[in-house]
Interface confidence: low
């Protein structure tokens, strides 16, 4: 399947050029998306190209600037947030990144009614998190690990928590492991729908072992960064959930929400909180052994001013074949009766599908079914449920948006996106206004991305929000590689792959092959999306064939494939990459003396193990920021897939699956090992141990470290990294510079 427009005229081809590495590093061919910042059923905000904040009304067609770029510039604001009563805007500046999602910033409150910044009782700085209540203009914020509340922006703050302490007690924000591996947010507080209550998590990291690493900076002595970071089997954070009445916060203070007895009986996690009404809240909990999850619906008891979570409102989700959920346990989407809900979990055939839970999970009504997976529930209204899936034409790497009419019986299903721009758009997400009156569709490819606005009743396209015209024009004289997505059937396993081929690809010739691998549990690399990136350049300019393969452990193709790696990381993911390479060689156009593999993070782990597999298939390979032993990685992630590193659990496979155990096998390959010294996620320790094992085995290898860089290797390090890797591959493949 050719996913790029083919070039027809020879005369045109002469004027066309290949991609350069500079194109990639400069982001010359990056695309834009348009996500409306919805503020009602028919209105949204958007930051214009000249940095004005503009309010658009779809129904009247009018737009007006609510905040000028001059006001934004006056405090160097990089972000904003309108209060729901439209009286105030917070402006965010001095952004300072912490971990993947978290950052601190300075916040200013601008009063739209008088066009001035609010003076008096200004917010402290830097703030770790700040948000408006869903109604009115109350503010909740986190400063120095404690939560504060303001009834109005100019009011003095009410301090809700007092025990917050750096690296010890976190209130309203997650610690490192909850941020990265459980919540995937920078916040851990949630307003009730009308702003009556504020729920928040408290994380106690007092007993967690600390990872310490040097940050070299510019000073005479390096700083030491200390992060409470539970590695596999270590002591975990202790979490508690509290709810406070924000109308009378001093009346009874924060009330703790009880943990279900079957969860509290051993180590556990809190996984998410969903408000149902102002007086009903849904909490999700997970046993440390992550195959049992409990969804608990709790009600406010006015007489006692407490939260009651009856056992009859506990819903248990258990996996007998793997871990609970996909990457995370799915969250419920409640219906209008405020007790029943829709949720994605595995059906009896082992495919993730939407279920409707009215009383018990056992009696759940299955809403979708088939040998494909429902991926996300976007919105439930009184008569429609919108979701995404990879059902259409049986391509797991696609995403289309569907509507199920739940107001009529029997419910009918309609694919909203399948035939809109079929060649250009096969991978969508969506963003809905209140009550789904309108929605935006964002198409990520395989053609050039496009964002459009639609009527939520009729699904009619109203207008194009962003079509990337400049990008389209810029690509007109570029020889892009060809891409195809196909599958291999091997021993009852389906291996989907994406192959990126040089523009003048000729099946009768032999090409060097580069495998790009990630391969982590519940990931997907073979997706029908647009990208002009480093591997596009390697195909376009350097004439390489690049392949991405989704093997066992990857997502959205059923539990059999997904859970195949349960408790056995590092085995089947590697086997399937090797199997695919053998199949690619059989296709006849691969030079089997020039095959390489590279990957980052989990992909660095897989590429390292593949190079050390002893197959003789790979000439060389690169591991960027690899995991080298699962004992070095975070408890929440690792134990989900591997169990505990204890003798009576899975210690043996923890030991067997290290890169270090295979040091000898690197003797016959060229290995480039790369890591940032300030990697808070996959610690530099991982690569340090690989290097030590290789030295001890007297195996030659190449290495590059990036001082003070984290897991993303950003900024100038990115340019250096890709330049360095390009040289390494060209040398490996005997390509001239």
């Amino acid at each position: 399947i050719v996913l790029r427009p083919s070039r027809v005229h020879n005369s045109e081809e002469n004027t066309m050029r290949a991609l350069t590495l500079k194109d990639i590093l400069n982001g010359t061919f990056s695309y834009k998306t348009f996500f409306p910042n919805w503020i009602s059923g028919q209105e949204y905000l958007h930051q214009s190209a000249d940095n004005n904040i503009v309010l658009y009304n779809i129904e009247t067609g009018q737009s007006y600037t609510i905040l000028s770029n001059r006001t934004m510039k006056s405090v160097n604001a990089s972000n904003y947030g309108l209060s729901p009563d439209r009286q105030f805007v917070y402006l965010e500046s001095d952004y300072s990144k912490l971990w993947r999602y978290s950052y601190t910033a300075t916040y200013y409150i601008y009063d739209l009614s008088n066009g001035e910044f609010v003076r008096g009782n200004e917010l402290p700085r830097p703030i770790q998190y700040l948000c408006w209540s869903p109604v009115g203009s109350k503010l909740a914020y986190v400063y120095q690990n404690n939560i504060y509340l303001k009834q109005r922006p100019g009011d003095p703050p009410f301090q809700i928590t007092f025990n917050g302490r750096e690296n010890k007690i976190f209130n309203g924000i997650p610690d490192w492991v909850y941020e990265e591996e459980m919540l995937a947010t920078k916040y851990a507080l949630w307003w009730s729908p009308n702003g009556k209550f504020l729920a928040y998590a408290e994380f106690n990291d007092t007993d967690i072992p600390v990872i310490a690493y040097s940050y070299y900076g510019d000073e005479q002595y390096p700083r030491t960064i200390n992060i409470p970071y539970p590695k596999a089997g270590a002591k975990n954070p202790v979490v508690r959930i509290f709810i406070i009445d924000t109308t009378y916060p001093a009346y009874v203070g924060p009330q703790e929400v009880p943990v279900p007895a079957m969860i509290a009986s051993s180590d556990y996690y809190f996984s998410w909180l969903t408000w149902v009404t102002d007086e009903r809240v849904c909490l999700q909990w997970l046993k440390r052994v992550q195959n049992v999850s409990v969804l608990s619906i709790c009600d406010f008891r006015e007489d006692w001013q407490t939260w009651d979570c009856p056992k009859t409102q506990e819903h248990i989700e258990e996996s007998r074949t793997g871990w609970a959920g996909g990457f995370f346990v799915s969250t419920p989407v409640f219906s209008y009766d405020a007790i029943s809900y829709y949720k994605i979990f595995s059906d009896k055939d082992g495919y993730k599908h939407i279920h409707y839970i009215k009383d018990t999970v056992e009696n759940a009504i299955q809403i979708t079914s088939g040998k494909w997976e429902a991926i996300n529930i976007f919105r439930v209204t009184q008569d429609s449920l919108f979701y995404s899936s990879n059902e259409f034409e049986e391509y797991p790497g696609r995403r289309n948006i569907y509507r199920i009419s739940i107001g009529s019986y029997p419910p009918s299903k309609k694919c909203v996106t399948c035939h809109l721009r079929k060649e250009r758009c096969q991978y969508y997400t969506a963003s809905f206004s209140d009550y789904a009156k309108y929605y935006a569709l964002v198409c990520y490819g395989p053609g050039i991305p496009i964002s459009t606005l639609h009527d939520g009743r009729t699904d009619q396209e109203i207008k194009i929000l962003e079509e990337n015209k400049e990008l389209e024009n810029a690509l007109k004289n570029i020889q892009l590689p060809k891409e195809e997505i196909k599958k291999l059937e091997v021993d009852e396993i389906t291996l989907w792959y994406k192959m990126i081929l040089p523009p003048q690809f000729d099946r009768s010739k032999k090409y060097p092959l580069l495998i790009q691998v990630y391969g982590g549990p519940c990931s997907q690399s073979v997706r029908s999306v647009f990208a002009v990136n480093w591997i596009s350049y390697l195909a376009s300019k350097e004439g390489m064939v690049i392949a991405l393969v989704d093997g066992r452990g990857t997502a959205f193709q059923g539990d059999k494939l997904l859970y195949a790696v349960y408790r056995k990381l590092g085995v089947y993911e590697v086997e399937d990459q090797i199997t695919a390479v053998r199949k690619f060689i059989e296709m006849g156009f691969i030079d089997e003396k020039r095959i390489a593999i590279w990957g980052w993070s989990y992909g660095g782990y897989v590429s390292s193990l593949a190079l050390a597999s002893g197959t003789g298939l790979f000439k060389c390979g690169i591991a960027v920021a690899p995991v080298s032993s699962w004992e070095y990685y975070a408890s929440v992630y690792t134990e989900r897939f591997m169990g505990l590193p204890t003798k009576d659990d899975n210690l043996e496979h923890y030991k067997n699956s290290t890169v270090m155990a295979r040091a000898e096998y690197f003797r016959n390959v060229d290995y480039l090992l790369i890591h940032g010294t300030a990697d808070d996620n996959v610690h530099f320790q991982n690569s340090a141990q690989i290097a030590k094992a290789l030295v001890n085995a007297q195996v030659d290898f190449q290495a590059m470290w990036y001082s003070d860089q984290n897991h993303g290797l950003s900024g100038l390090s990115t340019n250096h990294l890709y330049t360095h890797m390009t040289h390494f591959l060209k040398q490996c493949f005997s390509l001239s510079d």
Epitope: S265, S266, D267, K287, V289, P310
Partner: antibody, heavy 123, light 108 residues
């Protein structure tokens, strides 16, 4: 096939001790809560004690008030064996003791039972 | 502690008849209730769990119903092999796990 085989019963005097064993096979022993239930002659079923693994590698144990402080439940996951150490035995402890496997990881209903071992406490 | 009361203590019925056994809980057992069958000299056998889910290999003449504090086990048409003692058990609120006193189903 799941199998539970109890042993260690016998006749003892009041105040003496006895250790019951239950050899388990056919399932992943460490993953399931295991329970001792007893039945006095001609009487109904009475729960005695339960043991289950917690996520941190610890085990949690639970006892009926009538045996608390006298009986100790334990398990050896390496050889798939459940134990009940019974000290300070009384006449009212006379019963057939069954070992039972929980139906799921967390729930404590019992889908498999052993054949039982008889404990008689008599002076 | 949840106390389970089973009624009647003994039920005299003929083969082919319908049997309804009742189990009352002193406080809510939610949906966490199981039923067992025990024949003389034999080990208990799980029939029903989670109020109404039949255990593996249990014939469909056995069915469970109820919720909260009132539960029933129904045997739609008694077979000779069904004459035994039946126990209910709650696992909603424990420790302690509790069993009912049992109902003996005898041949009339």
């Amino acid at each position: 096939d799941v199998q539970l085989v109890e042993s260690g019963g016998g006749v003892v005097r009041p105040g003496e001790s006895l250790r019951l064993s239950c050899a388990a096979s056919g399932f992943i022993f460490r993953n399931y809560a295991m329970t001792w239930v007893r039945q006095a002659p001609g009487e109904g079923l009475e729960w005695v004690s339960t043991i289950r693994s917690s996520g941190s590698g610890r085990t949690d144990t639970y006892y009926a008030d009538s045996v608390k402080g006298r009986f100790t439940i334990s398990r050896d996951s390496s050889n798939n064996t459940l134990y009940l150490q019974m000290n300070s035995l009384r006449a009212e402890d006379t019963a057939v003791y069954y070992c039972a496997k929980s139906g799921t990881f967390w729930d404590t209903f019992f889908d498999y039972w052993g054949l039982g071992t008889l404990v008689t406490v008599s002076s | 502690e949840i106390v389970l009361t089973q009624n009647p203590g003994t039920l005299n019925l003929s083969p082919g008849e319908r049997a309804t056994l009742t189990c009352r809980a002193s406080q809510s057992a939610g949906r966490n209730l199981a039923w067992y069958q025990q024949k003389p000299g034999q080990t208990p056998r799980l029939l029903i769990y989670d109020v109404n889910t039949r255990a593996t290999g249990i014939p469909d003449r056995f069915s469970g119903s109820g919720s909260g504090t009132e539960f029933n086990l129904t045997i739609s048409s008694l077979q000779n092999e069904d004459f035994a003692v039946y126990y209910c058990q709650q696992y909603n609120n424990w420790p302690p796990l509790t069993f009912g006193g049992g109902t003996k189903v005898e041949i009339k």
